[in-house]
Protein backbone atom coordinates (compact mmCIF):
# COMPACT_ATOMS: atom_id res chain seq x y z
CA UNK A 1 0.00 0.00 0.00
CA UNK A 2 1.31 3.50 -0.83
CA UNK A 3 1.18 5.49 2.53
CA UNK A 4 -1.57 8.44 2.06
CA UNK A 5 -3.54 6.56 -0.37
CA UNK A 6 -6.86 4.87 0.43
CA UNK A 7 -7.14 1.72 -1.40
CA UNK A 8 -10.36 0.44 -1.70
CA UNK A 9 -11.33 -3.21 -1.51
CA UNK A 10 -14.91 -2.50 -1.37
CA UNK A 11 -18.23 -0.22 -1.94
CA UNK A 12 -21.63 0.14 -0.67
CA UNK A 13 -23.58 -1.19 -3.35
CA UNK A 14 -27.13 -0.08 -4.16
CA UNK A 15 -29.31 -0.87 -7.25
CA UNK A 16 -32.46 0.77 -8.12
CA UNK A 17 -33.41 -1.17 -11.30
CA UNK A 18 -32.20 -4.46 -8.99
CA UNK A 19 -35.40 -6.74 -10.33
CA UNK A 20 -34.78 -5.76 -13.99
CA UNK A 21 -31.10 -6.18 -13.55
CA UNK A 22 -31.27 -9.47 -11.38
CA UNK A 23 -28.70 -8.15 -8.61
CA UNK A 24 -29.12 -7.74 -5.07
CA UNK A 25 -31.04 -4.33 -3.64
CA UNK A 26 -28.57 -3.79 -1.63
CA UNK A 27 -24.74 -5.28 -0.06
CA UNK A 28 -21.68 -4.51 0.28
CA UNK A 29 -19.64 -5.11 -3.41
CA UNK A 30 -16.22 -6.24 -3.19
CA UNK A 31 -13.81 -4.42 -5.66
CA UNK A 32 -12.22 -6.51 -8.69
CA UNK A 33 -9.68 -4.96 -11.41
CA UNK A 34 -6.24 -5.64 -12.52
CA UNK A 35 -3.75 -5.55 -9.90
CA UNK A 36 -2.05 -2.63 -10.37
CA UNK A 37 -4.93 -0.07 -10.71
CA UNK A 38 -6.81 1.83 -8.65
CA UNK A 39 -10.18 1.09 -7.93
CA UNK A 40 -12.95 3.62 -6.45
CA UNK A 41 -16.49 3.69 -4.99
CA UNK A 42 -19.55 5.61 -6.83
CA UNK A 43 -22.66 7.11 -6.64
CA UNK A 44 -25.31 7.93 -8.74
CA UNK A 45 -28.97 9.36 -7.82
CA UNK A 46 -31.04 11.92 -9.22
CA UNK A 47 -32.68 14.84 -7.38
CA UNK A 48 -36.89 14.57 -8.43
CA UNK A 49 -38.72 17.85 -7.39
CA UNK A 50 -35.68 17.94 -4.40
CA UNK A 51 -36.36 14.39 -3.17
CA UNK A 52 -33.34 12.35 -3.45
CA UNK A 53 -33.77 9.03 -5.56
CA UNK A 54 -30.28 6.77 -5.60
CA UNK A 55 -29.86 5.04 -8.64
CA UNK A 56 -26.95 3.27 -8.24
CA UNK A 57 -23.66 2.98 -5.39
CA UNK A 58 -21.30 0.10 -6.16
CA UNK A 59 -17.62 0.22 -7.45
CA UNK A 60 -15.92 2.09 -10.26
CA UNK A 61 -12.39 1.57 -12.11
CA UNK A 62 -9.70 3.35 -12.43
CA UNK A 63 -10.27 6.89 -13.22
CA UNK A 64 -7.81 10.31 -12.24
CA UNK A 65 -11.11 11.65 -11.59
CA UNK A 66 -11.77 9.90 -8.13
CA UNK A 67 -7.64 9.87 -7.51
CA UNK A 68 -7.09 11.23 -3.48
CA UNK A 69 -10.88 11.74 -2.88
CA UNK A 70 -11.75 10.54 0.30
CA UNK A 71 -15.65 12.10 0.01
CA UNK A 72 -18.17 11.19 -3.05
CA UNK A 73 -18.70 14.92 -3.83
CA UNK A 74 -20.48 15.94 -7.18
CA UNK A 75 -19.28 19.20 -8.75
CA UNK A 76 -21.18 19.49 -11.71
CA UNK A 77 -23.56 22.31 -11.98
CA UNK A 78 -27.03 20.43 -12.25
CA UNK A 79 -26.46 17.25 -13.86
CA UNK A 80 -29.29 15.20 -15.20
CA UNK A 81 -27.92 12.21 -12.97
CA UNK A 82 -25.73 12.77 -10.16
CA UNK A 83 -22.44 10.86 -10.08
CA UNK A 84 -19.39 10.63 -7.69
CA UNK A 85 -16.67 8.72 -7.06
CA UNK A 86 -14.25 8.73 -3.73
CA UNK A 87 -11.53 6.09 -2.67
CA UNK A 88 -11.18 4.04 0.45
CA UNK A 89 -13.67 1.60 1.68
CA UNK A 90 -17.65 2.73 1.31
CA UNK A 91 -16.69 6.08 0.91
CA UNK A 92 -19.93 5.67 -1.15
CA UNK A 93 -22.14 5.30 2.22
CA UNK A 94 -22.52 9.27 1.81
CA UNK A 95 -22.67 11.62 -1.04
CA UNK A 96 -22.80 15.21 -1.46
CA UNK A 97 -23.44 17.85 -4.53
CA UNK A 98 -20.95 20.78 -4.00
CA UNK A 99 -21.78 22.94 -7.69
CA UNK A 100 -18.22 24.11 -8.45
CA UNK A 101 -19.59 26.79 -11.10
CA UNK A 102 -22.18 28.17 -8.41
CA UNK A 103 -22.08 32.35 -7.65
CA UNK A 104 -23.92 31.71 -4.38
CA UNK A 105 -23.21 29.48 -1.29
CA UNK A 106 -23.37 26.45 -2.85
CA UNK A 107 -25.72 23.98 -0.77
CA UNK A 108 -24.84 20.18 0.30
CA UNK A 109 -27.01 16.98 0.07
CA UNK A 110 -25.45 14.50 2.34
CA UNK A 111 -27.34 11.31 2.33
CA UNK A 112 -27.00 8.33 4.10
CA UNK A 113 -29.03 5.49 2.15
CA UNK A 114 -31.61 3.77 4.24
CA UNK A 115 -32.29 0.17 3.86
CA UNK A 116 -36.04 0.02 2.63
CA UNK B 1 -12.02 -12.29 -19.47
CA UNK B 2 -13.07 -8.57 -20.62
CA UNK B 3 -14.40 -8.11 -24.28
CA UNK B 4 -15.72 -5.72 -26.23
CA UNK B 5 -17.73 -7.02 -29.31
CA UNK B 6 -18.99 -4.36 -31.80
CA UNK B 7 -21.28 -5.23 -34.74
CA UNK B 8 -20.53 -5.65 -38.34
CA UNK B 9 -19.94 -3.90 -40.93
CA UNK B 10 -21.60 -1.04 -43.03
CA UNK B 11 -21.77 0.99 -45.74
CA UNK B 12 -24.10 4.42 -45.91
CA UNK B 13 -24.87 6.66 -48.53
CA UNK B 14 -23.72 10.63 -47.91
CA UNK B 15 -26.31 12.57 -45.76
CA UNK B 16 -27.68 9.43 -43.84
CA UNK B 17 -27.17 8.01 -40.43
CA UNK B 18 -25.03 5.19 -38.87
CA UNK B 19 -25.68 3.44 -35.10
CA UNK B 20 -23.30 0.99 -34.40
CA UNK B 21 -23.18 -1.03 -31.12
CA UNK B 22 -20.59 -2.24 -28.29
CA UNK B 23 -21.49 -4.91 -26.48
CA UNK B 24 -19.45 -5.51 -22.96
CA UNK B 25 -18.73 -8.58 -20.98
CA UNK B 26 -16.32 -9.90 -18.44
CA UNK B 27 -16.77 -6.85 -15.87
CA UNK B 28 -19.41 -4.47 -14.48
CA UNK B 29 -20.59 -2.78 -17.16
CA UNK B 30 -21.90 0.38 -15.09
CA UNK B 31 -18.34 0.27 -13.06
CA UNK B 32 -16.85 2.69 -15.87
CA UNK B 33 -16.49 4.52 -19.24
CA UNK B 34 -16.87 3.60 -22.97
CA UNK B 35 -14.65 5.52 -25.25
CA UNK B 36 -15.14 5.30 -28.86
CA UNK B 37 -12.25 6.45 -31.26
CA UNK B 38 -12.61 6.05 -34.97
CA UNK B 39 -9.09 5.61 -37.42
CA UNK B 40 -9.31 6.60 -41.74
CA UNK B 41 -8.06 4.30 -43.40
CA UNK B 42 -3.98 5.06 -43.21
CA UNK B 43 -4.99 7.61 -40.74
CA UNK B 44 -4.43 7.79 -37.13
CA UNK B 45 -6.44 7.62 -34.27
CA UNK B 46 -9.19 10.02 -33.63
CA UNK B 47 -11.14 10.36 -30.03
CA UNK B 48 -14.74 10.90 -30.69
CA UNK B 49 -16.46 10.71 -26.99
CA UNK B 50 -16.95 9.01 -24.00
CA UNK B 51 -20.03 8.13 -21.63
CA UNK B 52 -19.95 7.32 -18.14
CA UNK B 53 -21.96 3.88 -18.42
CA UNK B 54 -23.91 4.93 -15.13
CA UNK B 55 -25.00 8.12 -15.55
CA UNK B 56 -25.23 8.54 -19.22
CA UNK B 57 -23.09 11.58 -18.79
CA UNK B 58 -21.40 12.35 -22.07
CA UNK B 59 -18.35 14.29 -23.35
CA UNK B 60 -17.78 14.62 -27.56
CA UNK B 61 -15.05 16.20 -29.28
CA UNK B 62 -15.58 19.12 -30.52
CA UNK B 63 -15.26 18.41 -34.26
CA UNK B 64 -18.21 15.83 -33.99
CA UNK B 65 -20.28 17.89 -31.67
CA UNK B 66 -23.66 17.86 -32.89
CA UNK B 67 -23.07 14.69 -35.17
CA UNK B 68 -22.33 12.36 -32.60
CA UNK B 69 -24.17 10.45 -29.75
CA UNK B 70 -23.12 8.10 -27.45
CA UNK B 71 -25.47 6.38 -25.71
CA UNK B 72 -25.59 3.36 -23.16
CA UNK B 73 -28.02 0.81 -22.70
CA UNK B 74 -27.39 -0.79 -18.99
CA UNK B 75 -29.71 -3.98 -19.28
CA UNK B 76 -27.65 -5.20 -22.40
CA UNK B 77 -24.32 -3.89 -21.50
CA UNK B 78 -24.01 -2.16 -24.71
CA UNK B 79 -23.08 1.20 -25.81
CA UNK B 80 -23.60 2.78 -28.93
CA UNK B 81 -22.18 5.17 -31.24
CA UNK B 82 -24.32 7.55 -33.96
CA UNK B 83 -23.02 9.90 -36.28
CA UNK B 84 -25.04 11.82 -38.48
CA UNK B 85 -24.81 13.41 -41.90
CA UNK B 86 -22.65 10.84 -42.94
CA UNK B 87 -19.93 12.25 -45.60
CA UNK B 88 -17.05 10.04 -47.41
CA UNK B 89 -14.73 11.44 -44.86
CA UNK B 90 -16.54 9.61 -41.93
CA UNK B 91 -15.31 6.30 -44.17
CA UNK B 92 -13.50 4.67 -41.26
CA UNK B 93 -12.79 1.77 -38.70
CA UNK B 94 -14.86 2.95 -35.47
CA UNK B 95 -13.77 1.46 -31.96
CA UNK B 96 -15.21 1.34 -28.77
CA UNK B 97 -12.54 1.34 -25.54
CA UNK B 98 -13.03 0.45 -22.02
CA UNK B 99 -12.22 3.06 -19.20
CA UNK B 100 -10.50 6.43 -18.96
CA UNK B 101 -6.87 4.76 -20.39
CA UNK B 102 -8.90 2.92 -23.02
CA UNK B 103 -7.41 -0.61 -21.23
CA UNK B 104 -9.90 -3.14 -23.91
CA UNK B 105 -10.61 -2.10 -27.08
CA UNK B 106 -13.57 -3.69 -29.31
CA UNK B 107 -12.40 -5.15 -32.69
CA UNK B 108 -13.66 -2.43 -34.92
CA UNK B 109 -16.43 -1.43 -37.06
CA UNK B 110 -15.76 -0.49 -40.67
CA UNK B 111 -18.00 2.16 -41.64
CA UNK B 112 -17.81 2.84 -45.60
CA UNK B 113 -19.64 6.32 -46.97
CA UNK B 114 -20.33 5.96 -50.81
CA UNK B 115 -22.84 6.86 -53.32
CA UNK C 1 -7.55 20.29 -27.36
CA UNK C 2 -5.10 19.96 -30.16
CA UNK C 3 -3.67 17.07 -31.09
CA UNK C 4 -0.06 15.57 -29.61
CA UNK C 5 2.97 15.94 -31.67
CA UNK C 6 5.09 12.53 -32.41
CA UNK C 7 7.48 11.78 -35.14
CA UNK C 8 6.29 9.88 -37.93
CA UNK C 9 8.56 7.13 -37.91
CA UNK C 10 11.48 5.60 -35.92
CA UNK C 11 13.64 2.70 -36.55
CA UNK C 12 16.44 0.58 -34.94
CA UNK C 13 17.77 -3.08 -35.34
CA UNK C 14 17.19 -6.18 -32.94
CA UNK C 15 18.49 -5.39 -29.60
CA UNK C 16 18.63 -1.91 -30.02
CA UNK C 17 17.36 0.43 -27.74
CA UNK C 18 14.31 3.05 -29.53
CA UNK C 19 12.33 6.11 -27.90
CA UNK C 20 9.36 7.64 -29.28
CA UNK C 21 8.55 10.94 -28.10
CA UNK C 22 5.16 12.65 -27.62
CA UNK C 23 4.72 16.95 -27.11
CA UNK C 24 2.42 18.66 -25.73
CA UNK C 25 1.69 21.57 -23.50
CA UNK C 26 2.15 23.04 -20.27
CA UNK C 27 -1.88 22.23 -19.54
CA UNK C 28 -1.89 18.75 -21.07
CA UNK C 29 1.36 16.52 -20.96
CA UNK C 30 3.23 18.69 -18.80
CA UNK C 31 0.99 19.25 -16.05
CA UNK C 32 -0.70 16.26 -15.66
CA UNK C 33 0.42 12.40 -15.32
CA UNK C 34 -2.29 11.06 -17.58
CA UNK C 35 -0.63 10.28 -20.78
CA UNK C 36 -1.02 6.46 -22.43
CA UNK C 37 0.79 4.55 -24.88
CA UNK C 38 -1.16 2.08 -27.69
CA UNK C 39 0.66 -0.16 -30.04
CA UNK C 40 -0.62 -1.58 -33.04
CA UNK C 41 -0.48 -4.18 -35.36
CA UNK C 42 -1.55 -3.75 -38.79
CA UNK C 43 -5.54 -4.68 -39.12
CA UNK C 44 -5.52 -5.19 -35.55
CA UNK C 45 -6.93 -2.86 -32.66
CA UNK C 46 -5.07 -0.92 -30.35
CA UNK C 47 -3.56 -2.36 -27.41
CA UNK C 48 -2.75 -0.04 -24.10
CA UNK C 49 0.77 -0.66 -22.95
CA UNK C 50 1.40 2.24 -20.99
CA UNK C 51 -0.87 4.41 -18.63
CA UNK C 52 -0.38 7.00 -16.12
CA UNK C 53 2.80 8.13 -18.01
CA UNK C 54 5.01 5.28 -16.51
CA UNK C 55 2.80 2.33 -15.67
CA UNK C 56 2.96 -0.89 -17.85
CA UNK C 57 -0.11 -2.61 -18.52
CA UNK C 58 -0.14 -6.55 -17.16
CA UNK C 59 1.35 -8.49 -19.69
CA UNK C 60 3.07 -5.92 -21.33
CA UNK C 61 7.51 -6.76 -21.16
CA UNK C 62 9.36 -4.71 -19.19
CA UNK C 63 11.66 -4.01 -22.14
CA UNK C 64 8.75 -1.11 -22.97
CA UNK C 65 8.72 1.89 -20.40
CA UNK C 66 7.02 5.08 -19.83
CA UNK C 67 8.83 8.83 -18.40
CA UNK C 68 7.81 11.86 -19.05
CA UNK C 69 10.13 15.38 -18.79
CA UNK C 70 8.44 19.06 -19.16
CA UNK C 71 5.63 19.08 -21.99
CA UNK C 72 7.00 15.48 -23.40
CA UNK C 73 6.04 12.17 -22.81
CA UNK C 74 8.48 9.45 -24.08
CA UNK C 75 8.14 5.70 -24.41
CA UNK C 76 11.07 3.32 -24.54
CA UNK C 77 11.84 -0.09 -26.18
CA UNK C 78 14.96 -1.63 -25.23
CA UNK C 79 16.23 -4.83 -26.62
CA UNK C 80 14.23 -4.52 -29.71
CA UNK C 81 12.42 -7.35 -31.51
CA UNK C 82 11.25 -8.60 -34.97
CA UNK C 83 7.51 -8.28 -33.31
CA UNK C 84 7.68 -4.73 -32.02
CA UNK C 85 7.15 -3.24 -35.74
CA UNK C 86 4.32 -1.47 -35.05
CA UNK C 87 2.46 1.89 -34.93
CA UNK C 88 2.38 4.16 -31.50
CA UNK C 89 0.26 6.47 -30.45
CA UNK C 90 0.49 8.29 -27.28
CA UNK C 91 -2.64 9.21 -25.81
CA UNK C 92 -4.61 11.43 -23.44
CA UNK C 93 -7.59 9.73 -20.14
CA UNK C 94 -10.66 10.50 -21.77
CA UNK C 95 -13.79 10.46 -18.94
CA UNK C 96 -15.02 12.99 -16.86
CA UNK C 97 -14.07 15.89 -16.45
CA UNK C 98 -10.96 15.04 -19.29
CA UNK C 99 -11.39 14.89 -23.30
CA UNK C 100 -9.11 12.58 -25.28
CA UNK C 101 -6.37 13.25 -27.75
CA UNK C 102 -4.05 10.99 -29.34
CA UNK C 103 -0.64 11.67 -31.07
CA UNK C 104 -0.45 11.19 -34.98
CA UNK C 105 1.10 7.70 -34.76
CA UNK C 106 4.73 6.42 -34.95
CA UNK C 107 5.47 4.02 -37.08
CA UNK C 108 8.27 1.77 -35.55
CA UNK C 109 10.50 -0.46 -38.36
CA UNK C 110 12.53 -3.07 -36.82
CA UNK C 111 15.51 -3.07 -38.99
Known amino acids: AILGRSETQECLFFNANWERDRTNQTGVEPCYGDKDKRRHCFATWKNISGSIEIVKQGCWLDDINCYDRTDCIEKKDSPEVYFCCCEGNMCNEKFSYFPEMEVTQPTSNPVTPKPP | QVQLVQSGAEVKKPGSSVKVSCKAS????????INWVRQAPGQGLEWMGTINAVSGSTSYAQKFQGRVTITADTSTSTAYMELSSLRSEDTAVYYC????????WGQGTLVTVSS | QSALTQPRSVSGSPGQSVTISCTGTSSDVGSKNYVNWYQQHPGKAPKLMIYGVSKRESGVPDRFSGSKSGNTASLTISGLQAEDEADYYC???????????FGGGTKLTVL
Open chain 2, 97 to 104: ARGGWFDY
Open chain 2, 26 to 33: GYTFTSSY
Open chain 3, 91 to 101: GTFAGGKYYGV
